[in-house]
Each structure stands twice: as C-alpha cells, then as structure tokens.
C-alpha cells in the first residue's frame, strides 16, 4: 500500500488508478495514506473519474476515509440517486490524515479509464465552527498556519485550558455610601471558570444594606446546595449564602461597615447572574434647627454620619460663635450621632462706633449710638475752617460690617482746611510797610534755623517756601524751628511745628542764580486750623487773570524794614506786578549776570521804589485775591532782588508759583 508523502515533506501530489490514462485491470486494490502536519488537513479533488457504475458502488469504487469516518464512496461517471461520482467536488480530511482506497472487481462490461486526483495539505481554520457547535474560543479566536489561539476581552484572562475566558473580577472596592454591583456581563450570561471578589468598605459607623434587584439566575442543582456556581456574602460578624437558583435573595442588613461578596463559576452553564444595589445607614444626628435670621442648607429628612449642613445668614446678619466672627459654618455628623460643632448665631451686623473724624464730628442719624446694619451716621467738618473733601459725609452700616459712604468708600471722609481766608479787606495802594492785624495773614509761617525766613502754610501739614531759605537744612529737617499763628516774631505765644522732610526743587542750584527757587516742607503733624492759622490757596488755572501787569499782590514778613532791623511785628506791603520785560531789563545791568530773571519768576514793586520785600522775608508768599472765589492764593514766593531793598528802578523778584503746580501736587500726593 503506497503511503504517499508524510510531513515534514511537502504534502501535495497526484494519485491515479493503475494504468491511467489507460483502462484499469480487474481485481485491483490500491490504498494510499496521506498525512499532513498537525493543524493542517488534506484537500483532494478529481480531474478525471471513470469507474464502473454499480448499485451502491459495490463493484468498482474509490473510498475516501479520515480516521474511522468514511467521507465518500465513489463510482460511475456522474452521480445518481444512490451512487456518487466526485464531479467537481472537493474533499477534506477531518484531521491531518486521509485514506484513499481504489478497488476493481473481477470483471468490467466495458473498459474504464479509472481516475486521476490531486491532493494538497492546507491549514485548518479552527475558528470556523458549524452552526450549533460550541465555539472554539470563549471570546476571540485567532487562526494561523498549523493552529489557532484564543484571547480575551479586557477585564478577562485566559484560563489554563487555553479556551475559556475567566473574568478579572477581584479586588474591586466600593467606598461610596451607596452603589451597585453585579456579576460580570450582567444581564448577559456570566463568564465561566471565574472567581470574583467584591469589597464594600465604608467608614466606621456606617452599616451596609444589600438588596438583590431585577433578576437572579445562578446555576443550581436540584439536590445539592449550589455545587456549580455560587454567591457568598461575608461580614466581620457572619456569612450569608451560598446563593444560587432563580429566586431573588431577601434584603441583607449586615450591621457592618465592611462586606465581602464572593462569586465562583464553573466551566459550564449559561446563566445571567445577579445585581445588588447597596445602601448604608448610620445613627442619625439631631435635626439642625436654624438660628434666627439664618437657614440650614441642604435640607434633608435626616442627617447621618458624614452628612453635613451649612448655616447661611440673611443679608445684614453675620455668623458669630460668641464674639468670634466666622465667614462660613459647616457642621458634620459624627459616628456617635452628634454634630462636630455647636450651632452659631446669626447676629445683626454691628459696624461698631464710627472712627473719630479729625477736624470734624459724627452724628448718629438712625438713633443715639445705633451702629447696626443699615444704621446711618453723618460726618461733618468744623465749620468755617474745614470743608469735606469728595463725599457728603453720609455713611451707612453695610452688610460687610463697614461704614460705607454713598460712593462706596470705606475710608473716612477728609476734612480739608479751607484755604485763602483772611480778615483783611483790601484797601487802595499803601506806600510803605503796614503792620498786620490778627487774621490778616494766617498762612504766614516763621522759619528759624540759622537765618530768619518765611513760608506759607499749604493744607494743614505742608509749608511752601523758597529753596534758598532752607537749603542748608535739606539734610537735617528737624533743625528747622517752624512757628505759626503769631504776629510778633519774638512772642512766646505761637503754634510750634516741626519738619519731617524738606523737598527742594531738583532744578534749583544753590549760589548759581535763583531759577526754581521753590521748596516744600512736610510737617510731622497736622496743625489745627483756626482764624490765626489758615492755609493759603494754590493758584487755579485761571489765576493768571489776577496776576497781570499792575495787578496788586501782597507780600508779608518779618524781614528788614527801612530802619535796617528785622521787624518785631508782621509787616505787609501791597505791590503791583511789573511787566516781565521791564524787570528783565532792570537786572541785565551789572552787577547782575545776564539771564538773572527767568520765565519762572515774576517781579513786583514800584518803579520809584520804597515798597519791597527784604532779607528775612525770603520764602514768604506774594498773595493775590481771586475775586471769583474770594479766596487769597499764592502767586509768588519771595526770592531775591537788589542789594538795597526798595531801590528805585529795581524790583522784588518772586518765584512764579503757577509754573510749579504739577511739582507741588506730585510731591504732596507722593509723600
């Protein structure tokens, strides 16, 4: 019996009846055994077939068998109702071997030419299964030359039998206070050969409640308790189960905060499994009663362990625990059924007594001493000498606990001194110095510190003066002795002020002319404004209209008089402004260097002389009356002039203050 090729030789070839293509002889029997590699099968088809036809192919035949199974018995040329010829059919071995038997009987009625067939090994696709047959693999089947392998979906692992997918269903821990868990794939059939462990682990104080929901279907047995697949529930106190069958188990109140659920399946069956909805309970806390003027959120029927509530106060009320304010309040229910902190109060917001207003006063509008939410107070400034800056002085106690103006400001209003008030009524031109009366020049400041000089009060804590008058003290501001509120230079009755800082114009160069001869002194304390101490106004933009040539300004000071001594009493002189070109020309003759008079200066005095400021008046203000506001303002600062004061054809030279308004404002706002 020819065996034909065997693996590992190439498995393919040709088979033919003896004598083919001639007729075959009688009484022939020939057998071929073909063997393919493992995982392969054999394919056979006929290119020629001509055998004697007989009933059920009893005389001559070709028989194909694979193992114990006969695949076909073939004869004739074409198939009939009871006999089969191969025609164009292809035959496949069931495994990796195929037996072919050819037999002819003792006679042929006519010559038959037999058969010719071709065979070859081909890969078996193990992944294709006939309808109704169990699939090769649980999840995914992968064919390859000579074999196949199985793989599993995510969340599964291939069992050691290499075909079944076991669920990776252990180690899941549920920590929420409620939730759902189910058998893998629920409500589809659960996987075979799996062992699942689920844990519910809640904080101590909680008790887990298990409810089986929807459907329950776990493989069972009529006589033995859950021998195949089963569900078990374990707590630190007891074990529940095993459960199987089709009946939903009853609710399980575990009285435990930890539960372990075990689900084990075998290799067979087709069941949908189970679903559990779990909840938890704990000892409830006392129901929170909101304090007056407050409310609780969230509102719940009951509050148990870990539940919390917050208190929110109505507008105008604040959370207080005794005297201590809280921005927020949240209490948490503890395992022993008590809240972790006591209820606060919602107390009406109290803005407290309003701050005192320097140079002003406060009046309670709502009621005497009422400082709670929506209470109104009215600030006002001391009349005559102070005026309120920016706001109207009305403040309301707002919900944030701050007194707040109608403009939303939480800071105090400012009582700003009224500037430019004087007791003096201007008369006509007066030739020669006059003695000042009380209240005539309340801005006048006497500066002592090496030499005698003057200055003018600005606001209530600044003095405007000449740079040359305080140059020596620029680094030792505290050496300046500043006096105000007096007419007599040597009087012991005056208001003392001390300097905190001296600011000399950066464009001023000492001993090199008097351009930019301007300085500011910051006082270390505010002075109290009254009829004898009042600041001078700074010039408005429109001030130039009151400072034209021949307009009268007034200079005051304790400087040298005609007698050559410093004045004991404050003196003043009314002098007209001199045309700038005329003044420039007056100081272009020797001994004055060219360009002595700059655009930052103005000149005042009489051509005939006799009225002038002099040494000791330096830094004092040359003031003008603004007839629109009826306030005095500083137009010039006593700076320099001829060696002989009041000399004919020479004039007093003053720093032109209007040119320095930005400089003054910047320093005052910065410091």
């Amino acid at each position: 019996t020819p065996l034909g090729p065997k693996w590992p030789e190439p498995v393919f070839g040709r088979l033919a009846s003896p004598g083919f293509p001639g007729e075959y002889a009688n009484d022939q029997e020939r057998r071929w055994t073909l063997t393919a590699p493992p995982g392969y099968r054999l394919r056979l088809y006929f290119t020629h077939f001509d055998l004697e036809l007989s009933h059920l192919c009893e005389y001559d035949f070709v028989k194909l068998s694979s193992g114990a199974k006969v695949l076909a018995t073939l004869c004739g040329q074409e198939s009939t109702d009871t006999e089969r010829a191969p025609g164009k059919d292809t035959f496949y071995s069931l495994g990796s071997s195929l037996d072919i038997t050819f037999r002819s009987d003792y006679s042929n009625e006519k010559p038959f030419t037999g058969f010719e067939a071709f065979y070859a090994a081909e890969d078996i696709d193990e992944c294709q299964v006939a309808p109704g047959e169990a699939p090769t693999c649980d999840h995914h089947c992968h064919n390859h030359l000579g074999g196949f392998y199985c793989s599993c979906r995510a969340g599964y692992v291939l069992h050691r039998n290499k075909r079944t997918c076991s669920a990776l269903c252990s180690g899941q821990v549920f920590t929420q206070r409620s939730g759902e868990l189910s058998s893998p794939e629920y409500p589809r059939p659960y996987p075979k050969l799996s062992s699942c462990t689920y844990s519910i682990s809640l904080e101590e104080g909680f008790s887990v409640i298990l409810d089986f929901v929807e459907s329950f279907d776990v493989e069972t047995h009529p006589e033995t308790l859950c021998p195949y697949d089963f569900l078990k529930i374990q707590t630190d106190r007891e074990e529940h189960g095993p459960f199987c069958g089709k009946t939903l188990p009853h609710r399980i109140e575990t009285k435990s905060n930890t539960v372990t659920i075990t689900f084990v399946t075998d290799e067979s069956g087709d069941h949908t499994g189970w679903k559990i909805h779990y909840t938890s309970t704990a000892q409830p806390c006392p129901y929170p009663m909101a304090p007056p003027n407050g409310h609780v959120s969230p509102v719940q029927a009951k509050y148990i362990l870990k539940d919390s509530f917050s208190i929110f106060c109505e507008t105008g009320y604040e959370l207080l625990q005794g005297h201590l304010p809280l921005k927020s309040f949240t209490a948490v229910c503890q395992k022993d059924g008590s809240w972790d902190r006591p209820m606060p109060a919602c107390s009406i917001v109290d803005c407290g007594p309003p701050d005192d207003l320097p140079s002003g006063r406060v009046e309670y509008i709502t009621g005497p001493g009422v400082t709670t939410y929506k209470a109104v107070i009215q600030y006002s400034c001391e009349e005559t000498f102070y005026t309120m800056k920016v706001n109207d002085g009305k403040y309301v106690c707002e919900a944030d606990g701050f007194w707040t103006s109608s403009k939303g400001e939480k800071s105090l209003p400012v009582c700003e001194p009224v500037c430019g008030l004087s007791a003096r009524t201007t008369g006509g031109r007066i030739y020669g110095g006059q003695k000042a009366k009380p209240g005539d020049f309340p801005w006048q400041v006497l500066i002592l510190g090496g030499t005698t000089a003057a200055g003018a009060l600005l606001y209530d804590n600044w003095v405007l003066t000449a740079a040359h008058a305080v140059y020596e003290q620029k680094h030792d501001a505290s050496a300046l002795d500043i006096r105000m509120g007096t007419l007599k230079r040597l009087s012991p009755h005056y208001t003392q002020a001390w300097s905190e800082a001296v600011f000399i114009h950066e464009g001023y160069t000492h001993d090199a002319g008097f351009d930019n001869d301007i300085a500011l002194i910051k006082l270390n304390n505010k002075v109290v404004i009254n009829s004898n101490i009042t600041p001078i106004c700074l010039p408005r933009k429109e001030a130039e209209s009151f400072m034209r040539t021949d307009d009268i300004g007034t200079a005051s000071g304790w400087g040298l008089t005609q007698r050559g001594f410093l004045a004991r009493n404050l003196m003043y002189v009314d002098i007209p402004i001199v045309d700038h070109q005329k003044c420039t020309a007056a100081y272009e003759k020797p001994p004055y260097p060219r360009g002595s008079v700059t655009a930052n200066m103005l000149c005042a005095g009489l051509e005939s002389g006799g009225k002038d400021s002099c040494r000791g008046d330096s830094g004092g203000a040359l003031v003008f009356l603004d007839s629109e506001t009826e306030r005095w303002f500083v137009g010039g600062i006593v700076s320099w002039g001829s060696m002989n004061c009041g000399e004919a054809g020479q004039y007093g030279v003053y720093t032109k203050v209007i040119n320095y308004i930005p400089w003054i404002e910047n320093i005052i706002s910065d410091f």
Partner: antibody, heavy 115, light 107 residues
C-alpha cells in the same frame, strides 16, 4: 498645616510704639476666622488684645482701645499689631492665634519694655 | 468684663487618677468656652472648644462640660505628660477673657 509665626523687636523703649508681625502659612487670612493677638505677662496671666477678621474688621480689648491698632497685608498673608505709648507694664510674650474651631497659636515672641 | 475664675491655683493628682479642673464665669457665656493646656516654655495648646467639643488629635481622656457660668475640664486616667497649666477662656463677648490658670502636679 496652618502655621503662625510672630516677629518683631524684643526690646522697646517706654513711650515708643511696639510693632509685631504675624506671618501665616498654610491658610489664607481672608478665607475665614478671626486673627488674634494675645499676650502673656510674667506670671502667666493671659490677656486677649484684639483681632482682625477675615473681612478686615477689627475688635479690640477696650482696655487697650486708645493704644492698639491691628492691620493686615493680604498679599503677604500677614497681620500686624501696633501698640502705642508702651510702658514697662507691656512687657510680655506676645502670641498671634486663630481661636475657636480651628485653633492655632504661634510660638510667641518675648517683648521687654525698658529704657 | 467677664471674669473667669479658676479657684484652684494648684491641683495634685496621681498617674491613672481622674481629675476635674473648674472654671466659673461672672456672667452667662452660653457654651462659648475653650480650655487650653500650657507646658513650660511652650505656647498654649487648645484642648476643648464650645465647652465640650474636643479638638482633633486631643486624647479622649480630656472631656469638657458645662454651660452658662460653670465649666469643668475632666482628665480621666491622668498621664505623666498631662503635667501642665490649664486655662479656661470665654469668647462670648468683648473682651475675650482667660482664667488665671490651674497648675496640675503629678504626685
């Protein structure tokens, strides 16, 4: 963790002002609570001086009201104590603290008032 | 001002004993009372707030009770590390005030 740290001069002359800083880490002073200054005199007597709340409002011990000021710098998460016109009676260890349900104290800073 | 009176300046006890420190307010302070423990060279450490609420990390042998004007700090099973001075404090109204302190001595 919330931490409070006091800082300032250990010696102040009578009639001068005492200025202390409390630097807070781990919690914003605008988030909640009242931020207090407390002092402990030799002999261990404790005195509450005042607080500045999360909103910036202040409350002072009436016995100190004319001399005390508590302010804050929210950008630096600091609050400050200024006590004016000090005398030898103000010699103490000064603490900054949050009181009530969140209770943290600084380590304290010793201040001596002496000429 | 509300005066918080701790009448006992010193208390002597043994390890394992139970001891009660008392504090009396001169007027009603509701439950707005805190208790502090201060060891030498350290800043005060809060034990109890709102009369009976224990701060986290405070051993449960420390318990507070009382309301209105009478308050008690109880230490059950006293330990050697409890040697300290104990202060009560009211925060019901301005000014907040402290008791004068009770020193606990271990026999």
């Amino acid at each position: 963790d919330v931490q409070l740290q006091e800082s300032g001069p250990g010696l102040v002359k009578p009639s001068q002002s005492l200025s202390l800083t409390c630097t807070v880490t781990g919690y914003s002073i605008t988030s909640d609570y009242a931020w207090n200054w407390i002092r402990q005199f030799p002999g261990n007597k404790l005195e509450w001086m005042g607080y500045i709340s999360y909103s910036g409002r202040t409350s002072y011990n009436p016995s100190l009201k004319s001399r005390i000021s508590i302010t804050r710098d929210t950008s630096k998460n600091q609050f400050f104590l200024q006590l004016n016109s000090v005398t030898t009676e103000d010699t103490a260890t000064y603490y900054c603290a949050i009181l009530y349900a969140m209770n943290f104290w600084g380590q304290g800073t010793s201040v001596t008032v002496s000429s | 001002d509300i005066v918080m009176t701790q009448s006992q300046k010193f208390m002597s006890t043994s390890v394992g004993d139970r001891v009660s420190v008392t504090c009396k307010a001169s007027q009603n302070v509701d439950t707005n009372v805190a208790w502090y423990q201060q060891k030498p060279g350290q800043s005060p450490k809060a034990l109890i707030y709102s009369a009976s609420y224990r701060f986290s990390g405070v051993p449960d042998r420390f318990t507070g009770s009382g309301s209105g004007t009478d308050f008690t700090l109880t230490i059950s099973n006293v330990q050697s590390e409890d040697l300290a001075e104990y202060f009560c404090q009211q925060y019901n109204s301005n000014p907040l005030t402290f008791g004068s302190g009770t020193k606990l001595e271990i026999k």
